[in-house]
């Protein structure tokens, strides 16, 4: 707490300008009116204040707005945003995307801080859903943002927002997240033709069920091995050798290099060795000829 001292004669601030950077801590406290500061917040960001000076300015705003800052002030916080705690931010009601962008810009190039995470959470909750413009903005600043959300949170993403998602935005998503995102992507891109559809849906295929993979195998999509390796194991296992061959096209040769890794390893174990041999890749580990394959899951279902 800065002790209250009278402002020296002639030092009372008439406006927020660069002369204030020469004020000592106590002079800023005594000579800058909080209401003046609030109305001229847009000027603060242009002035190279030290962290000590920014602390004093924040203290003034806290006293003026104990229940939380109005959006007119928040939008112009600039570098002062870095001084805010998550507790401060929880008091805010941020509704404008422009305000969000302005504050994210201050933190640009840094990892998502607790302050930024709180700000985003407040903003998205206030909007009720993660709309396209918001998602566009957030993934532009934080490509991994989407994958930081829980499956429950992702369920509030409308299919129309999926258009804003870039492949790199999904790099760190796990299968549970892709399970939620894939049906939304399928819906969003449903009116596209075959090749264009595949380009768009490819990043989301880690959430695709078997029947969708079977359908894709009929469309000459030539899926690359990197995408294939990210598919759900349970979705790949029922695919026949012929379907995988059609799905991968010329990339089928890459299976050999991946034969010890999931889902390829598990898929090989489910195929007849005869069928695997037709690929001519030397894949080993399939079901030997003459063996009877019982689908126990089907038997359990019948009983």
């Amino acid at each position: 707490e800065v002790e209250k001292t009278a402002c020296p004669s002639g030092k009372k601030a008439r406006e927020i300008d660069e002369s204030l950077i020469f004020y000592k801590k106590w002079e800023l406290e005594a000579c800058v009116d909080a209401a003046l500061l609030a109305t001229q917040m847009d000027r603060v960001n242009a002035i190279p204040f030290t962290y000590e000076q920014l602390d004093v300015l924040k203290h003034k705003l806290d006293e003026l707005y104990p229940q939380g800052y109005p959006e007119s002030v928040i939008q112009h916080l600039g570098y002062l945003f870095l001084k805010m705690s998550p507790e401060d931010i929880r008091k805010w009601n941020v509704t404008s995307l422009e305000t969000l962008k302005a504050l994210l810009e201050v933190n640009k190039g840094h990892e998502m801080s607790p302050q930024v995470a709180t700000l985003i959470d407040r903003f998205v909750k206030g909007r009720g859903q993660l709309d396209k413009d918001t998602l566009d903005t957030l993934t532009a600043f934080y490509p991994g943002y989407l994958c930081s959300l829980s499956p429950e949170e992702l369920s509030s993403v409308p299919p129309s927002s999926i258009w804003a998602v870039r492949p790199q935005d999904l790099d760190t998503c796990d299968p549970r997240q892709l399970d939620v995102l894939y049906p939304k992507a399928r819906l969003a891109f449903q009116n596209m033709n075959g090749s264009e559809y595949f380009v768009k849906i490819q990043s989301f295929l880690g959430g695709a069920p078997t029947e969708d993979l079977k359908a894709l195998s009929q469309q000459n999509v030539s899926m690359d091995l990197a995408t294939f390796m990210k598919l759900r194991t349970d979705a790949v296992l029922p695919l026949t050798v012929a379907e995988v061959q059609k799905l991968l096209g010329p990339h089928v040769e890459g299976l050999k290099a991946e034969e010890r890794h999931r889902p390829v390893r598990d898929w090989i174990l489910r195929q007849r060795q005869d069928d695997l041999d037709t690929l001519g890749l030397g894949l080993q580990g399939g079901i030997p000829n003459g063996y009877l394959v019982l689908d126990l899951s089907m038997q359990e279902a019948l009983s």
Partner: antibody, heavy 119, light 110 residues
Framework: QVQLVESGGGVVQPGRSLRLSCAAS????????MSWVRQAPGKGLEWIGV???????FYADWVKGRFTISRDNSKNTLYLQMSSLRAEDTAVYYC?????????????WGQGTLVTVSS | DYQMTQSPSSLSASVGDRVTITCQAS??????LAWYQQKPGKAPKLLIY???DLASGVPSRFSGSGSGTDFTLTISSLQCEDAATYYC????????????FGGGTKVEIK
């Protein structure tokens, strides 16, 4: 290559003046606050002053007007003008980039230039 | 005035030892503290900023902690190349400052 190179050091008589330069390459000096720091032989680091991105200058309390920091953005160069030099000003003088627009840690240093004040 | 006091002024330790250096500010500087390493005849090098963030390229055996007035630099397992003088510096204010740096701690290898 990002670097700061100081020059202008040498032997100078007490009471005389000297101007040190710090030339930057690979970075735009106008985007950062810049500082001067010195180190007397066998002693610790001593902060001299800083010039922020707007050209405002701040000095350590002991400087008392004898040193002046300036910058020429068109030449991407920082300067330290020293006057009324004394024997105790003998030191290696470093320029350093401040990781902020105003004041903060020094994340890039020059190699230093030695100033010897002696008659 | 903001003053920085470092201790000890020197220490000697063996390779593999855990080494701790402290820095005290005369008044709160929150977490705005940096640590530097300086080897003889060389310019200082930034090790840690904002009290605990490791600068780019600095080995993970270096760590920093503290906030307010009391700060610590720790070398978890001392290596031969860590023989140097270490300085702290406040990055909170540039007014009322006699010296932004602490007095330094010389670390020698036994």
């Amino acid at each position: 290559q990002v670097q700061l190179v100081e020059s202008g050091g040498g032997v100078v008589q007490p009471g005389r003046s000297l101007r040190l330069s710090c030339a930057a390459s690979g970075i735009d000096l106008s985007s950062y606050a810049m500082s001067w720091v010195r180190q007397a032989p066998g002693k610790g680091l001593e902060w001299i002053g800083v010039i922020d991105i707007s050209g405002n200058r701040f000095y350590a309390d002991w400087v008392k007007g004898r040193f002046t920091i300036s910058r020429d953005n068109s030449k991407n160069t920082l300067y330290l003008q020293m006057s009324s030099l004394r024997a105790e000003d003998t030191a290696v003088y470093y320029c350093a980039r401040v990781d902020s627009r105003a004041w903060g840690p020094f994340n890039l240093w020059g190699q230093g230039t030695l100033v010897t004040v002696s008659s | 005035d903001y003053q920085m006091t470092q201790s000890p002024s020197s220490l000697s330790a063996s390779v593999g030892d855990r080494v701790t250096i402290t820095c005290q500010a005369s008044q709160s500087i929150f977490s705005y503290l940096a640590w530097y390493q300086q080897k003889p005849g060389k310019a200082p090098k930034l090790l840690i900023y904002d009290a605990s963030d490791l600068a780019s390229g600095v080995p993970s055996r270096f760590s920093g902690s503290g906030s307010g007035t009391d700060f610590t630099l720790t070398i978890s397992s001392l290596q031969c190349e860590d023989a140097a003088t270490y300085y702290c510096q406040q990055g909170y204010t540039r007014s009322d400052v006699d010296n932004a740096f602490g007095g330094g701690t010389k670390v020698e290898i036994k």
